[in-house]
């Protein structure tokens, strides 16, 4: 492996700046951007837009850049310190017990329910009993049974016979 | 039902040591990365440390970089923490953490651990 970093290596804003020699471990760690040697003795650059670290560090390689599936979109880049950011498409939401997929949000609350949050792409909108104003349990309602309204638009109180 | 269980906290002058353990009941422990996260008395948690699921390899908070040391025995099921040069700031509780399915190689924020210890508490006082 070449002690020097090539500019390919180095995001377009750093490109113009001379080419950067390893650095020396510090206290046994490499800092962020960064991963140590085989031999401990270097400190040598993740690369760009491929692999990344985000604390100090022994590791042997830097970490794999995640690349957004298919119904996320990319809120921002891999750098050699952070990992890419992916979020769910709108209409869709990632649950924190299930991180590895997008869920197609609900289109309406259950009869009886009005919708009080919004489709995010963290949350799947969020229904309380209009009485009582207390939380659905998130089961997918019958779609007769469905009040529906469009993802980002307030829900209107709804009129229906019960 | 994943089970974690710190030990090896307790009370320590500045500048000691102490070695933090955490035995795991999850069989998934040996394919997974592993982190200590602490809580100061009114303070959110923090990241300490994780290392890799297959030990090669882990991160460091920088306000313990090179006096702590984590470690990992896949055969036990346990994760190590030793901590030396030990601070005032240092005290607090210290968590064993596994994370979420689906996270990054080496998750090192609170949001992507699921799985929690109970803790066990560290003081450092003269």
């Known amino acids: 492996e070449s002690a020097l970093i090539t500019q390919q290596d180095l995001a377009p804003q750093q490109r113009a700046a001379p080419q950067q020699k390893r650095s020396s471990p510090s206290e046994g760690l490499c800092p962020p951007g960064h991963h140590i040697s085989e031999d401990g003795r270097d400190c040598i650059s993740c690369k760009y837009g491929q692999d990344y670290s985000t604390h100090w560090n022994d590791l042997l390689f830097c970490l794999r850049c995640t690349r957004c599936d298919s119904g996320e979109v990319e809120l921002s880049p891999c750098t050699t310190t952070r990992n890419t950011v992916c979020q769910c498409e709108e209409g869709t939401f990632r649950e924190e017990d299930s991180p590895e997929m997008c869920r197609k949000c609900r289109t309406g609350c259950p009869r009886g329910m009005v919708k009080v949050g919004d489709c995010t792409p963290w949350s799947d909108i969020e229904c309380v009993h209009k009485e009582s104003g207390t939380k659905h349990s998130g089961e997918v309602p019958a779609v007769e049974e469905t009040v529906t309204s469009s993802p980002g638009t307030p829900a209107s109180p709804c009129s229906l016979s019960g | 039902e994943v089970q974690l269980l710190e030990s090896g906290g307790g009370e320590v002058q500045p500048g000691g040591s102490l070695r933090l353990s955490c035995a795991a009941s999850v069989s998934t422990f040996g394919t997974s990365p592993v982190g200590w996260f602490r809580q100061a008395p009114g303070k959110e948690r923090e990241f300490v440390s994780a290392?890799?699921?297959?030990?090669?390899?882990?991160y460091y908070a920088e306000s313990v970089k090179g006096r702590f040391t984590i470690s990992k025995d896949n055969a036990k099921r346990t994760l190590y923490l030793q901590m030396s040069s030990l601070r005032a700031e240092d005290t607090a509780v210290y968590y064993c953490?596994?994370?979420?399915?689906?996270?990054?190689?080496?998750?090192?924020?609170?949001?992507?651990?699921?799985?929690w210890g109970q803790g066990t508490l560290v003081t450092v006082k003269p």
């Open positions: 953490a596994l994370p979420r399915r689906g996270e990054s190689e080496l998750p090192s924020t609170v949001k992507e651990y699921g799985y």
């Open positions: 290392i890799r699921w297959d030990a090669v390899g882990a």
